[in-house]
């Protein structure tokens, strides 16, 4: 025996209260596949979420984050505040990277400048809060096992970032 509900297309549900008639999904609900016995509630894009695609009877709404926030998680399930390059997000807000660290993204955390001297190179371009140092050619007089004559940049060990 074929299940009568299998004939109900997407956008409808099999209504047990009405002799398994295919009824349209009520407002603010959807069914993306046929044969459903209930319709799912549409996702609401509220607060820091904004609507990227409206809900229809056959597909859920899609959200993204309002300007100043970025998506995390499947289907943009979370929004996290952006900062500027050269900053990192703490509970007290966006804080500048400490000296010797940088962040070239609007999200994430600061990380230490590369220590050019570890590879026997010199600093060609100094680092900033937004950019890593650029390492240049090998330091004069460098050979493996000897230290660089260039004053080393801060080692790539994390410093204490501001809270």
């Amino acid at each position: 025996l074929q299940d009568p509900c299998s004939n109900c297309p997407a956008g409808t549900f099999c209504d047990n209260n009405r002799n398994q008639i295919c009824s349209p999904c009520p407002p603010n609900s959807f069914s993306s596949a046929g044969g459903q016995r209930t319709c799912d509630i549409c996702r609401q894009c509220k607060g820091v979420f904004r609507t990227r695609k409206e809900c229809s009877s056959t597909s859920n709404a899609e959200c993204d984050c309002t300007p100043g926030f970025h998506c995390l998680g499947a289907g943009c399930s979370m929004c996290e505040q952006d900062c500027k390059q050269g900053q990192e997000l703490t509970k007290k807000g966006c804080k500048d990277c400490c000296f010797g660290t940088f962040n070239d993204q609007k999200r994430g955390i600061c990380r230490p400048w590369t220590n050019c001297s570890l590879d026997g190179k010199s600093v060609l371009v100094n680092g900033t809060k937004e950019r890593d140092v650029v390492c240049g050619p090998a330091s004069a007089g460098f050979s493996p096992g000897t230290s660089s004559v260039t004053p080393p940049a801060p080692a790539r060990e994390p410093g204490h970032s501001p809270q």
């Epitope: 998680g73 955390i109 990380r111 970032s161 809270q163």
Partner: antibody
Framework: QVQLVQSGAEVKKPGESLKISCKGS????????ISWVRQMPGKGLEWMGK????????NYSPSFQGQVTISADKSISTAYLQWSSLKASDTAMYYC?????????WGQGTLVTVSS | DIELTQPPSVSVAPGQTARISCSGD??????AHWYQQKPGQAPVVVIY???NRPSGIPERFSGSNSGNTATLTISGTQAEDEADYYC???????????FGGGTKLTVL
């Protein structure tokens, strides 16, 4: 869609070396931190360390510093966790996860069994 | 590094409120996040940044964080909420993430 796919289960003997992998897809792999998390049988989650694949900068939990090595190859969007000499106490499920504070995507886990 | 302490187990009757605590020195100065893990599965975020709920997580999940304690609250607990729950925080001192020991929630 974003996915982290880990290499398969491993059975090893004490003293052997091992390198497990975590391949990211569906996002800019180079610009998101990847963390590794250990879960010993019947126990809780332990954060081991993280890597920024863009420049391979790593940072370890003090408990795991010197015990494991985390690396990445951004050209193939893959992060690695490796041991030079396994111990029986390394038997655990190992997860990779995207992020450094909020872990929004997780791999399926790699079960590592170390037994003589 | 900060240490996060959770009760090993919490039991609750269906429909009642479950509260899971996570204590650590001045955890309120950092963001706390909460993960749910069911047997054989990877963890899933249920609360992030102290009190924010990802879409797809039921409204009965809520969080708070101040002083030395972060709390995950599940109002009207359902059988499907039975799982292990872990708090975590990222500390800028040491640049590390720490997980609590985990709490097994049993729905009676």
């Amino acid at each position: 869609q974003v996915q982290l796919v880990q290499s398969g289960a491993e059975v090893k003997k004490p003293g052997e070396s091992l390198k497990i992998s975590c391949k990211g897809s569906g996002y800019s792999f180079s610009t998101y931190w990847i963390s590794w998390v250990r879960q010993m049988p019947g126990k809780g989650l332990e954060w081991m360390g993280k890597i920024y694949p863009g420049d391979s900068y790593t940072n370890y939990s003090p408990s795991f510093q010197g015990q494991v090595t985390i690396s990445a190859d951004k050209s193939i969007s893959t992060a690695y966790l490796q041991w030079s000499s396994l111990k029986a106490s390394d038997t655990a499920m190992y997860y990779c996860a995207r992020g450094y504070g909020i872990f929004d995507y997780w791999g399926q886990g790699t079960l590592v069994t170390v037994s003589s | 590094d900060i240490e996060l302490t959770q009760p090993p187990s919490v039991s609750v009757a269906p429909g009642q409120t479950a509260r899971i605590s996570c204590s650590g020195d001045n955890i309120g100065d950092q963001y706390a996040h909460w993960y749910q893990q069911k047997p054989g599965q990877a963890p899933v975020v249920v609360i992030y940044q102290d009190k924010n709920r990802p879409s797809g997580i039921p409204e009965r999940f809520s969080g708070s964080n101040s002083g030395n304690t972060a709390t995950l609250t599940i109002s009207g607990t359902q059988a499907e909420d039975e799982a292990d729950y872990y708090c975590s925080t990222y500390t800028f001192v040491g640049f590390t993430t720490v997980f609590g020991g985990g709490t097994k929630l049993t729905v009676l």
